[in-house]
C-alpha cells in the first residue's frame, strides 16, 4: 500500500504484495523506495539543504513502535532492535529505504510502515507481515530423553511438524519460550531455551538468560526434540458425545465427520491461531491434550498453551486408550495420511508426546549424568510472558494445581490419585497474540515416460565405513522422490513432508551413502535430513560429475538454505501391513481407485509403502495408482519388456523430462495397502 499527498510530490512504495508470510526464525527484506521530485529543500540561502528523513515503524493492535530513523546518512536504531533491523542499502543509495529484519519471531508480526519526510512533504507505504509457525517441545511418551536424532525427526514428522532449526528456537526464545529440557535441533545440536536461569538449568550460560547448547551430539545419544509446525490449510475441531470417546472411538468419530484425529503439531497451530478449549481430547499419537489461549485458574492453572494429560504423576505415560475424552479432529485439504498403526500398537517407543517434569520432582534419567544442568533436572512452571522485551524477562512463578470444573482425569494406576491436565511448564505459550509401463499393457493411448529409479535396499556393505552413532537400518529402502509437477520443486520443509506423506522419512546422509555403496545411482539432487543436498553416482557422466569430477561417489552441494528447491531422498523401513495389486477390465480412475481401496477396508498405497513392498519381493509389470496421484510399478526381476535391466520401482510420467502426473481421469490398475 502506498500513499502520497498529491501528484508530482514525494512518493513512497513497497513493491510487495501484502500480507507477506514468512517463517519464524528467518530473515526478511522489505523493499521501500521513494521518489523525491523536489530539488534539495533549503530554508534560507545560507542554510544547507534538508535531507529526506526515513522512519520505519511497526504497528500492531496494541501499539506502534518506531524501529529506526535515518537522515543525512545517519541511522538511529531503537535500542531494543539494535541487532535486529538495518537499512542495508542506505546511505549508499539515498532513495532506497529497504528494511532488513533478522531472526523473525511471532512478535514481529504486524504492519510495517516506511515513512519519508522531506521538508513539509510526507509520504508513506505499509506492508503487513505475518510470521508463520510455532516451536514446541516434544518428548517420547514413555520417559524423558529417549529420542535419538533419527527418531526425534520422525516424532516431529508424525506430528505435522519438522525438527526446528537453531534460528527458530532462538526466535521462539525471544518470543518468551522457556523450557528446561534438552532437545535435538535440525543441525544435530542439542539445546534448550532458558529465561530465568536456576540450578539444574544453567547449561553453558551460567546465570545468563539464553538458549543453552551442548553443541553437535552423536546421533545415537537420546534427548527430547524441538519441533516446528509451519501452518495448516485445514481446521481443528472438537467432537463430543454423552459418554465421550475411547481412543478408537475418537478415531472413528473423526472419520465419520470426514476428518482425522489431529496431530500435536496441528493442535499447536490451532492454539497459536486462538483456539481455546477447556476440555481434553484424543490426538493421533494417543496423547490427550487441550489448548488454552485465555488464562483462567480452573483451566490449565492460569497458564496459556497446549496442556497435556498424563498417566503418571511424574508427567510421563499416556492415558489408557479405553479411557474417555473428547475427540480432537483435523479436517482440511492437507491431510497427512497417517496409517492407523503408525504410532505402534501397545509399544511406547514411537509414541511421543510433549511433556515437562512435575515441579520439584526429579525424573530418573536414562544414564549417569555428571553435570546436573546438562539434563535440566527440575522444572518449575513459569508465568506466561506477554510482551517480552529483549531486556526484561518475566519472573518465574510456581503454580498451584487446581482441578477442572467437571470430572477429574484419573490416573490408570493402583494409587488412586487424580491427574489434572495441567502442571506442565509453558511450551511456546508466550505472546500468542504466541499407467503404462514400457511393455504393452492394456491402457489408455497416451505417451507415457517411465523413469528408471534404481532403488536398492540399504544393508551394510562388507567393509563399508560405519558412521559412529548412526546404526545401519538393515532392510530399509532409500528412494528418490519428486512430486509429479516438476523437477526440483521442494523446499527443505516440503521435502520432509513429502517423504512423510509417502509413508517414509527423509533419508540421512549415512542411509544414502549405504544405498550408494549397494549400487544406488540417481542423477538428481535431493534434500537429506541434515539440510544438505546430495546425489549418488556410481558411473560418472557429464551432467552428473558434481563435486567429485570423474570419481564415483555421493555428490554434495553442502548445507543449502531451506528455501532452495530440489527433489528429496526418502527412507522407508519395514512395511506394517500389505500392499496388494488390484485390477479389473475397465481399470480405475484415480478417484475410483481411492474408493475401491476404501471399500476393501484399505487405503491407496503410498509411494513409500510400494517401495517397502518391492523390497519384500512385490513384482508387477503393471503400473498402478498410488495415494499421491502417481503411477508406479515394482520390478524385482528385470526383463527387457518390463522396466529396463535393473530392479526398482518405476514411475510413469506424463512428459519426457520425467515430470507431470497422469491425468486423474485416465484409467490404470491400483495398489492398495491394508
Amino acid at each position: 500500500e502506498e500513499t502520497s499527498d498529491h501528484d508530482n510530490s514525494l512518493s513512497v512504495s513497497i513493491p510487495e504484495p501484502s500480507p507477506m508470510r514468512v517463517l519464524l526464525g528467518s530473515s526478511l527484506t522489505i523493499p521501500c523506495y521513494f521518489i523525491d521530485p523536489m530539488h534539495p529543500v533549503t530554508t534560507a540561502p545560507s542554510t544547507a539543504p534538508l535531507a529526506p528523513r526515513i522512519k520505519w515503524s511497526r504497528i500492531t493492535k496494541e501499539k506502534e513502535v518506531v524501529l529506526l530513523v535515518a537522515t543525512e546518512g545517519q541511522v538511529r536504531i531503537n535500542s531494543a532492535y539494535q541487532d535486529k533491523v538495518s537499512l542495508p542499502n542506505y546511505p549508499a543509495i539515498p532513495s532506497d529505504a529497504t528494511l532488513e529484519i533478522q531472526n523473525l519471531r511471532s512478535n514481529d508480526s504486524g504492519i510495517y510502515r516506511c515513512e519519508v519526510m522531506h521538508g513539509i512533504e510526507d509520504s508513506e507505504a505499509t506492508l503487513e507481515v505475518v510470521v508463520k509457525g510455532i516451536v514446541f517441545h516434544y518428548r517420547a511418551i514413555s520417559t524423558r530423553y529417549t529420542l535419538d536424532f533419527d527418531r526425534a525427526q520422525r516424532a516431529c514428522l508424525q506430528n505435522s511438524a519438522i525438527i526446528a532449526t537453531p534460528e527458530q528456537l532462538q526466535a521462539a526464545y525471544e518470543d518468551g519460550f522457556h523450557q528446561c529440557d534438552a532437545g535435538w535441533l535440525a543441525d544435530q545440536t542439542v539445546r534448550y531455551p532458558i529465561h530465568t536461569p536456576r540450578e539444574g538449568c544453567y547449561g553453558d550460560k551460567d546465570e545468563f538468560p539464553g538458549v543453552r547448547t551442548y553443541g553437535i551430539r552423536d546421533t545415537n545419544e537420546t534427548y527430547d526434540v524441538y519441533c516446528f509446525a509451519e501452518e495448516m490449510e485445514g481446521e481443528v475441531l472438537y467432537a463430543t458425545s454423552p459418554e465421550k470417546f475411547t481412543f478408537q472411538e475418537a478415531a472413528n468419530e473423526c472419520r465419520r465427520l470426514g476428518a482425522r484425529l489431529a496431530t500435536t503439531g496441528q493442535l499447536y497451530l490451532a492454539w497459536q491461531g486462538g483456539m481455546d478449549m477447556c476440555s481434553a481430547g484424543w490426538l493421533a499419537d494417543r496423547s490427550v491434550r487441550y489448548p488454552i489461549s485465555k488464562a483462567r485458574p480452573n483451566c490449565g492453572g492460569n497458564l496459556l498453551g497446549v496442556r497435556t494429560v498424563y498417566l503418571h504423576a511424574n508427567q510421563t505415560g499416556y492415558p489408557d486408550p479405553s479411557s474417555r475424552y473428547d475427540a480432537i479432529c483435523y479436517t482440511g485439504e492437507d491431510f497427512v495420511d497417517i496409517p492407523e498403526n503408525f504410532f505402534g500398537v501397545g509399544g511406547e517407543e514411537d509414541i511421543t508426546i510433549q511433556t515437562v517434569t512435575w515441579p520439584d520432582v526429579e525424573l530418573p534419567l536414562p544414564r549417569n549424568i555428571t553435570e546436573g544442568e546438562a539434563r535440566g533436572n527440575v522444572i518449575l512452571t513459569v508465568k506466561p510472558i506477554f510482551d517480552l522485551s529483549p531486556t526484561a524477562p518475566e519472573p518465574e512463578e510456581p503454580f498451584t494445581f487446581v482441578p477442572e470444573p467437571e470430572k477429574p482425569f484419573t490416573f490408570a494406576t493402583d494409587v488412586g490419585v487424580t491427574a489434572f491436565p495441567e502442571a506442565e511448564n509453558r511450551t511456546g505459550e508466550a505472546t500468542r497474540p504466541w499407467g503404462v509401463p514400457e511393455e504393452s499393457t492394456p491402457g489408455p493411448a497416451f505417451t507415457a515416460f517411465t523413469s528408471e529409479d534404481h532403488v536398492v535396499q540399504v544393508t551394510a556393505v562388507p567393509g563399508a565405513a560405519e558412521v559412529p552413532g548412526q546404526p545401519r537400518l538393515p532392510g530399509g529402502v532409500v528412494f528418490h522422490y519428486r512430486p509429479g509437477s516438476a523437477r526440483y520443486s521442494l523446499t527443505f520443509e516440503e521435502a520432509q513432508q513429502a517423504c512423510l506423506r509417502t509413508g517414509a522419512v527423509i533419508a540421512s546422509p549415512e542411509q544414502l551413502q549405504a544405498a550408494y555403496e549397494a549400487g544406488y545411482e540417481q542423477c538428481d539432487a535431493g534434500w537429506l535430513q541434515d539440510q544438505t543436498v546430495r546425489y549418488p553416482i556410481v558411473s560418472p557422466r557429464t551432467p552428473c560429475v558434481g563435486d567429485k569430477d570423474s570419481s564415483p561417489g555421493v555428490r554434495t552441494y553442502g548445507v543449502r538454505p531451506p528455501s532452495e528447491t530440489y527433489d528429496v531422498y526418502c527412507y522407508v523401513d519395514k512395511l506394517e501391513g500389505e500392499v496388494f495389486f488390484i485390477t479389473r477390465l475397465e481399470q480405475f480412475t484415480f478417484q475410483e481407485a481411492l474408493a475401491f481401496c476404501e471399500s476393501h477396508n484399505a487405503t491407496l498405497a503410498s509411494t513409500g509403502q510400494l517401495y517397502a513392498a518391492w523390497r519384500q519381493g512385490l513384482d508387477k509389470c503393471y503400473a498402478g495408482w498410488l495415494s499421491d496421484g502417481s503411477l508406479r510399478y515394482p520390478i524385482v526381476t528385470p526383463r527387457p519388456s518390463c522396466g529396463g535391466d535393473k530392479p526398482g520401482v518405476r514411475t510413469v510420467y506424463l512428459y519426457p523430462n520425467q515430470t507431470g502426473l497422469p491425468d486423474p481421469l485416465s484409467r490404470h490398475h491400483v495398489f492398495c495397502f491394508r
Epitope: 475441531l237 463430543t240 477447556c278 476440555s279 480452573n298
Partner: nanobody
Amino acid sequence: EVQLVESGGGLVQAGGSLRLSCAASGRSFSSYAMGWFRQAPGKEREFVSIISWSGGSTVYADSVKGRFTISRDNAKNTVYLQMNSLKPEDTAIYYCAAGRLYRATPRPADFGSWGQGTQVTVSS
C-alpha cells in the same frame, strides 16, 4: 436429539440491551456445544457465538465481540445470550442451536438441533 425453544427477543433502541434464553429439553444437554446464529432479511444465516459443552470455552463473531456474552447453566438446561450496546445492524431472527462439534469457525452444519428463532429488532 434435544428440542430448543428461544425467548427474550423484542424491540429495543440502539444502545440498549436484551437477554435471549434458549431452553433445551431432552437428554444429556451437557454434552452439546450450544450456539447462537442470526439471519437478517435477505441474508444468509450467520454465526454469532458458541459455548463448549463444559461452558469453559467460547467463541464470538468479530461483529459482536465485546458486546455480546454467551453463557450456559447445565443444571437448568439453558443457554443465554446477553446482548449489550445493540446496533440497528443487529436486527435479525436469532436462532439457538445444539451440536456435538466445537470449532473456531462454527458453521450451521455442525448443529443437529435448531430452535424456531426469536425476533430482535433494534431501532435507531
